[in-house]
């Protein structure tokens, strides 16, 4: 069972002094979101008993193993159900405390009732303040039963629950009709999942015979020991004022465990600490009684005296629960109450005994849960004891359970049961996870879900190149940290597997499933430099670069050109996918923009060093195209062009450019400037007769604009061959010749 105790301080004169403390003896308990699981939770459960809202309760954590609830302002704040949750995973356990108001109309004779499946449970509510009206019993907040007030027996209202089953478990209350629920008697009924003395699926297994009021857990057969007792069967008393599964906790305050209620995991429930009784656990046990709630009787023999915390204290020469055994009777000494081994190991178990006559090797035997008896292989005889050593055959899961060491001599016999837990070494259920990779290293997360038992003591990472027959490389790592595999080969697949271990001999589990992790390519090391660049238009740029000459093959798949537009905060990336390329045309750029330009070699997904940057200013874009361009032949060597100014100009036009080309001709076109921007007509002279020409034009502001539509026109016939076209413009509005 989980080592979890909920303590309630019942010194109730002042509710503000009331507190609840939850203490965990579990390894790593309450450490929060670390590898070992969730923290301790302590809260009031308002689902069944609702009290008037008040200021919120204060929760204080005292280290990792303890949490305390304070801040109760009035007695009604205390009434109801409180719960503490601790332990991780499948071991997560809820411990419940039910608080009754000392001034209630009805009070429970006993708050916690633990019964076996099929038993009859009897809940008894004692009349504290009489009301001559019906009593309503509720189960988990819902109506259950009614009693007429005449049905009280000796000032008590009894609820009989025959043949109880586990679903009958829960919070029961007895309330006078039309009285405040805070005046109710609240009970907790715990129904074990098995009949008396049995546990396990199908209730086929026998309980170990828990002593001193311990209760056998119906799931795992362990004894949940009352506060103040320890051992597999609760056979050992703790020192006064101590509690916890190993007596490791100490009651706070100078009066020890007085005034404290202890609640433990089901099926134990709650009780006073050892040596105390009463509704507020403030009364010491009467002579001859001891233990939690003083429920146990000493009945000491042979001059033993009764200690209210531990039971019979025997005079020398006697031992046993009632001092009924003579020291001549052999006695098993210092047997651990619980041992843990890993599956398929062959452990050695020691069992020591003393007595008169002295036990010898053959008089000590070891009995397994299935009844098999093992004889010792050797014995060490010392003046005060004999220690027999047993070599246990290879352990299987069925060996889990209660083993027994037995000593028999002519003076009598003694036996001691102890629990053996056979644990399954952990086996990863998944492959490790790749976090990041480089050319020569892989960063791996090794901790994965696993089957079998924890805790994980070590994690081994095994790795080797894929399809290799070489030995595996192994690295031992911390379970909670990521691992870097170093000195690997670039661009290589590695098979990686995890192996988990738990403490103890044979705790190494089988290797987990493999996963393939591939290192990255080698990083390209060469730094290109920009040879030059030139603008091929307002939005086009040709760039060329070089690489240093080095021996051996070039490590790279291509180049990445980057253009940074600082004004707009935008980056343009151009991929050149040939490592042989040394030039590239960048198009679709933004005219009039100042760019920073660099180039890098890349290989796979890795980038080499960038070239020193260059700063390039693209010319701004020109104006829109002139409109309605029209050509009209005037003679055998002249054609007149007319047009309209472009619309939505970004500024004043500096000139027009006319392009003249012979239709179907193979030569370069001729560009002629019209230097007076106000012109809307010009005459192109010096043309050949009877020749078909193509014309188009564009305007210029700071840069050249878009071309207009192309127009065709033929000169008139039979003139002389001209020297070449020239131009005469006319300002339509002024009528000037040029």
């Amino acid at each position: 069972a989980v080592d979890l105790t909920l303590l309630a301080n019942l010194r109730l004169t002042d509710p503000q002094r009331f507190f609840l403390t939850c203490v965990s003896g579990e390894a790593g308990a309450g450490r929060g979101s670390d590898a070992w699981g969730p923290p301790l939770l302590l809260e009031k459960d308002d689902r069944i008993v609702r009290t008037p809202p008040g200021p919120p309760l204060r929760l204080a954590r005292n280290g990792s193993h303890q949490v305390t609830l304070r801040g109760f302002s009035k007695p009604s704040d205390l009434v109801g159900v409180f719960s503490c949750v601790g332990g991780a995973g499948a071991r997560r356990t809820r411990v419940i405390y039910v608080h009754n108001s000392p001034g209630a109309h009805l009070l429970p004779d006993k708050v916690t009732h633990t019964v076996n499946k099929g038993d009859t449970a009897v809940l008894s509510a004692r009349v504290h303040k009489e009301k001559q009206t019906d009593v309503i019993w509720k189960s988990n907040g819902s109506y259950f039963y009614t009693l007429d007030w005449h049905e009280a027996q000796d000032g008590r209202f009894l609820l009989q629950l025959p043949n109880v089953q586990p679903p009958s478990s829960g919070i029961y209350s007895a309330t006078y009709l039309e009285a405040s629920p805070l005046g109710s008697a609240f009970f907790r009924l715990i129904v074990r999942g098995c009949g008396a003395g049995r546990w396990g699926p199908g209730c086929t297994k026998e309980c170990p015979g828990c002593l001193h009021g311990g209760v056998c857990h119906d799931h795992d057969g362990e004894c949940v020991c009352p506060p103040g007792f320890t051992g597999t069967r609760c056979e050992q008393a703790c020192r006064e004022g101590r509690f916890g599964q190993s007596c490791q906790e100490q009651c706070p305050g100078i009066s020890g465990c007085r005034g404290l209620t202890f609640c433990l995991p089901d099926p134990y429930g709650c009780s006073c600490g050892s040596g105390w009784r009463g509704s507020q656990c403030q009364e010491a046990c009467a002579p001859g009684h001891f233990g939690a709630d003083c429920r146990l009787q000493c009945q000491c023999q042979n001059g033993g005296t009764c200690d209210r915390f531990s039971g019979c204290v025997c005079p020398s020469g006697w031992h046993g629960v009632h001092c009924e055994k003579s020291d001549r009777i052999p006695q098993i000494l210092n047997m651990a109450s619980e041992l843990e081994f890993n599956l398929e190991t062959m452990p050695r178990i020691n069992c020591a005994a003393a007595g008169n006559p002295f036990p010898v090797r053959g008089s000590i035997e070891l009995r397994k849960p299935d009844g098999t008896v093992l004889l010792s292989t050797k014995a060490i005889v010392e003046p005060e004891k004999t220690t027999a050593e047993f070599e246990v055959p290879r352990l299987v899961l069925a060996d889990s359970g209660f083993w027994e060491c037995r000593v028999s001599t002519s003076g009598g016999q003694d036996s001691r049961r102890f629990k053996v837990n056979v644990k399954v070494p952990p086996v990863p259920l998944a492959a490790p996870r790749l976090l990041t990779k480089q050319s020569r290293q892989l960063v791996v997360s090794p901790l994965v879900s696993f089957s079998g038992d924890g805790p994980i003591s070590t994690v081994r990472l095994h790795y080797r190149p894929q399809d290799s027959t070489m030995d595996w490389s192994t690295i031992v790592v911390d379970p909670s940290e990521n691992v870097t595999l170093m000195n690997l080969r670039p661009k290589t697949g590695y098979s990686v597997r995890v192996q988990l271990s738990r403490p103890g001999e044979g705790g190494e589990g089988a290797w987990g499933p493999p996963t393939l992790m591939t290192t990255d390519c080698p990083e390209p090391l060469l730094q290109p430099w920009l040879e030059g660049w030139h603008v091929e238009g307002t939005d086009r740029l040709r760039v060329s670069w070089s690489l240093p000459l080095v021996p051996g093959p070039l490590v790279g798949d291509g180049f990445l050109l980057r253009l940074w537009d600082g004004t707009r905060g935008q980056e343009r990336r151009e991929n050149v996918s040939s490592p042989q390329a040394r030039t590239a045309l960048l198009t679709g750029l933004t005219p009039g923009t100042h760019y920073q330009l660099d180039v890098q070699l890349y290989h796979c997904t890795l980038l080499g060093p960038a070239s020193p940057p260059a700063h390039v200013l693209l010319p701004p874009s020109g104006p829109p195209a002139p409109r309605h361009l029209h050509a009209q032949a005037l003679s055998d060597s002249e054609i007149q062009l007319t047009w309209k100014h472009p619309e939505a100009l970004p500024g004043p036009i500096s000139k027009y450019v006319v392009e003249v080309q012979v239709a179907g001709g193979a030569g370069d076109p001729l560009w002629i400037d019209v230097d007076r921007p106000e012109e809307t007509s010009t005459i192109i002279r010096g043309l050949n007769a009877s020749t078909r020409y193509l014309f188009r034009m564009r305007a210029s502001i700071q840069g050249l604009g878009d071309w207009s539509n192309t127009v065709e026109e033929s000169t008139l016939g039979n003139g002389l061959q001209a020297e070449g076209p020239v131009q005469e413009s006319r300002a339509a509005e002024e009528g000037l010749d040029q």
């Epitope: 009614t146 007429d148 039309e178």
Partner: antibody
Framework: EVQLLESGGGLVQPGGSLRLSCAAS????????MVWVRQAPGKGLEWVSS????????YYADSVKGRFTISRDNSKNTLYLQMNSLRAEDTAVYYC??????????????WGQGTLVTVSS | QSVLTQPHSVSASPGKTVTISCTRS????????VQWYQQRPGSVPTTVIY?????PSGVPDRFSGSIDSSSNSAFLSISGLKTEDEADYYC???????????FGGGTKL
């Protein structure tokens, strides 16, 4: 589903006897207090008698005390009303009802359809 | 034994709010919880309010109950009246001394 079904009503002469039954289903009958309530033609509701879950304690309206007896058989999930020395003013529809407890008060949460008792010569 | 007195009938128009009173003749109205039942013509009674002011599930929030100690009365209010609300309404309380379940005379709405 909770169901209450009355039977045993009919015509009876003054001074005569009649036994009403109420068969219950759909809930743990042995845990609930049960009552008989009647309603004379064109009149209001009148509580007649109640019986506690154990059957050990019973209560009656003054108008029927000494003449009517309420009982229950928890093994058969049945409630009874034995009516003796019947009078004309006992003519009514007789309902059996279950008492439930919302918070800490009781109220009649399920009613049968009723059975008519007519006392007439 | 105390008596619970209700008006014989009340009437109101659809959509309006109506309040039915239930006055206790002796003893404090607040010392016992009051329940209200609705009985439509030809039907069995059903609970609309229990414990003075609590509604069973399924009862619309147009129905509300209250207690007024100064007039020693309990009240049932129905807002947004619908024709389906036309019925007899009974108040009821418990006499803890005699163990009697006491009904009011009923109010026809």
């Amino acid at each position: 589903e909770v169901q209450l079904l009355e039977s045993g009503g009919g015509l009876v002469q003054p001074g005569g006897s009649l036994r009403l039954s109420c068969a219950a289903s759909g809930f743990t009958f042995s845990h609930y207090m049960m009552v008989w309530v009647r309603q004379a033609p064109g009149k209001g509701l009148e509580w007649v008698s109640s019986i506690y879950p154990s059957g050990g304690w019973t209560y009656y309206a003054d108008s029927v005390k000494g003449r009517f007896t309420i009982s229950r058989d928890n093994s058969k999930n049945t409630l009874y009303l034995q009516m003796n020395s019947l009078r004309a003013e006992d003519t009514a529809v007789y309902y059996c009802a279950r008492l439930d407890y919302g918070g800490n008060s009781a109220y009649f949460d399920y009613w049968g359809q009723g059975t008519l008792v007519t006392v007439s010569s | 034994q105390s008596v619970l007195t209700q008006p014989h009938s009340v009437s109101a128009s659809p959509g309006k709010t109506v309040t039915i009173s239930c006055t206790r003749s002796s003893g404090n109205i607040a010392s016992n919880f009051v329940q209200w039942y609705q009985q439509r013509p030809g039907s069995v009674p059903t609970t609309v309010i229990y414990e003075d002011d609590r509604r069973p599930s399924g009862v619309p929030d147009r129905f509300s109950g209250s207690i007024d100690s100064s007039s020693n009365s309990a009240f049932l209010s129905i807002s947004g009246l619908k024709t389906e609300d036309e019925a007899d309404y009974y108040c009821q309380s418990h006499d803890r001394t005699t163990r009697a379940w006491v009904f009011g005379g009923g109010t026809k709405l």
